[in-house]
């Protein structure tokens, strides 16, 4: 690469959140070069040594990748070409949490970029009229989060007011020993009103909505990713 | 069109070693888009996954066989192989070599047909 | 390491029946999931892959669905080419892990 070392490329990165045991992705791109042979992707992860992933001469080359990354890692091969350097990453771990970098190198020059990856688990939560308690209550369950969330009700009716003492919420350890289910359960609701459900962490914040009425249920959830 | 063939002795006595040989044509096992594992099929049960190596010699192996698996890379042959050693009984099946789809997904395809190998004195 | 349990162990069909084979894993496998179909004396062959992506040159009654830990296979019309044995296979991490094995057998 006789220019590779003159010339500077542009690369961007972005950060982002993966759900542990799903698969995620590490988002980079870079000024696309048609010459797929003469694009080399590295993936580095801060404080590990070897590579994440390593793509060149149009290939994968995982001669360098360290261990805990083996078998968990791709590129979209198919669009290098057009500047996407993003990194697949397989059943996503709390330890992949950190900082990496997406170092590249082209007919064009070279650049990098670093991004902040973080881990956790977050689910959208189903919330349900609760027929078997004494008086009308929900139940808000989501079955998977971490690290712990902290849970909160509001109505449309009784904008502002504080539902801690009516609501019980509790964090059920899930098999694998990480991620926890959350259930919550508020009391004395009223018919003809739209409660909601917040679950939030510092990864992201999901929210579930029901409002029920004499002749109907109607349900509604989102998830959104915190600072990503 | 990628094949796969297995070769080595198809009886071993107890206590011995097992090694096997798998002949890659139609393709490069140098090719880093790929794992290479080992995979056996004890008589009339199910299949079992023994581990894999990379055309750099990196390996990892089923923790269950750990203790006495070894596999090998020749990429100037276009061979990889398995030994296992203080072989028993039990390690009698059919032993295959395949290719993982790619490095992120590791189903098998394609395979070799296979060899049977029987640990008898 | 994560278990693969197949059901049923045996399931007796006629052509041109639909038959669904289920495969459990013992914690989430998201979509990583393989199908494998096996004849006496012959090497496993690849049917499905990423629980639902029929593999090429593969029959296209032939299907997979499911994600986490439930998955199905699917063959829509059996043909008597499929009577044979059928192997799941969870590729989510390290042991990899196959199926106890479904044998489809001619009813």
């Known amino acids: 690469f006789g220019i590779s070392g003159k010339h500077f490329i542009t690369v961007t990165t972005f950060t982002s959140a993966g759900n542990i045991g799903e698969d995620g992705t590490l988002s980079c791109t870079f000024e696309p070069d048609i010459k797929l042979n003469g694009i080399v992707i590295q993936w580095l992860k801060e404080g590990i040594k070897g590579l994440v992933h390593e793509f060149k001469e149009g290939k994968d080359d995982l001669s360098q990748q360290h261990e805990m990354f083996r078998g968990r890692t791709a590129v979209f091969a198919d669009q290098v070409v057009v500047g996407n350097a993003s990194l697949r990453l397989k059943n996503v771990q709390l330890t992949d949490a950190g900082t990496y970098t997406c170092y590249i190198r082209t007919s064009k020059g070279k650049g990098n970029a670093n991004l902040e990856y973080k881990t956790g688990a977050f689910s959208m939560p189903e919330i349900n009229v609760d027929y078997n308690a004494s008086s009308e209550s929900l139940r808000c369950e989501a079955p998977r989060w971490f690290p712990q969330p902290t849970v909160a009700w509001a109505s449309q009716v009784d904008q502002g007011a504080n539902f801690s003492e009516v609501s019980n919420t509790s964090f059920e350890l899930n098999s694998e020993n990480v991620t926890m289910k959350v259930v919550s359960v508020l009391y004395n609701v009223t018919i003809n009103n739209t409660y909601s459900c917040m679950i939030e962490n510092d990864i992201a914040k999901a929210t579930g909505d029901i409002k029920v009425t004499d002749s109907e249920v109607k349900r509604r959830s989102q998830l959104q990713l915190l600072n990503s | 069109q990628l094949q796969l063939q297995e070769s080595g002795p198809g009886l071993v006595k107890p206590s011995e070693t097992l090694s096997l040989t798998c002949t890659v044509s139609?393709?490069?096992?140098?090719?880093?888009?790929?794992?290479w594992s080992w995979i056996r099929q004890h008589p009339g049960k199910g299949l079992e996954w023994i581990g894999n190596?990379?055309?750099?010699?990196?390996?990892y192996y089923n923790p269950s066989l750990r203790s006495r698996v070894t596999m090998s890379v020749d990429t100037s042959k276009n061979q990889f192989s398995l030994k296992l050693s203080s072989v028993t009984a039990a390690d009698t099946a059919v032993y295959y070599c395949?290719?993982?789809?790619?490095?992120?997904?590791?189903?098998?395809?394609?395979w070799g047909q296979g060899t049977l190998v029987t640990v008898s004195s | 390491d994560i278990q693969m349990t197949q059901s049923p162990s045996t399931l007796s069909a006629s052509v041109g029946d639909r038959v669904t084979i289920t495969c459990r894993a013992s914690?989430?496998?998201?979509?990583?999931l393989a199908w494998y179909q096996q004849k006496p004396g012959k090497a496993p062959k690849l049917l499905i892959y990423?629980?639902?992506s029929l593999e090429s040159g593969v029959p296209s009654r032939f299907s997979g669905s499911g994600s986490g830990t439930e998955f199905t296979l699917t063959i829509s019309s059996l043909q008597p080419d499929d009577f044979a044995t059928y192997y799941c296979?969870?590729?989510?991490?390290?042991?990899?892990?196959f199926g106890g094995g479904t044998k489809v057998e001619i009813k």
């Open positions: 296979q969870q590729d989510n991490s390290y042991p990899y892990t």
């Open positions: 990423k629980a639902s």
């Open positions: 139609g393709g490069s096992i140098s090719d880093g888009s790929y794992y």
């Open positions: 395949a290719r993982g789809l790619s490095t992120i997904d590791e189903a098998f395809d394609p």
């Open positions: 914690q989430s496998i998201s979509s990583w």
């Open positions: 190596i990379y055309y750099s010699g990196s390996t």
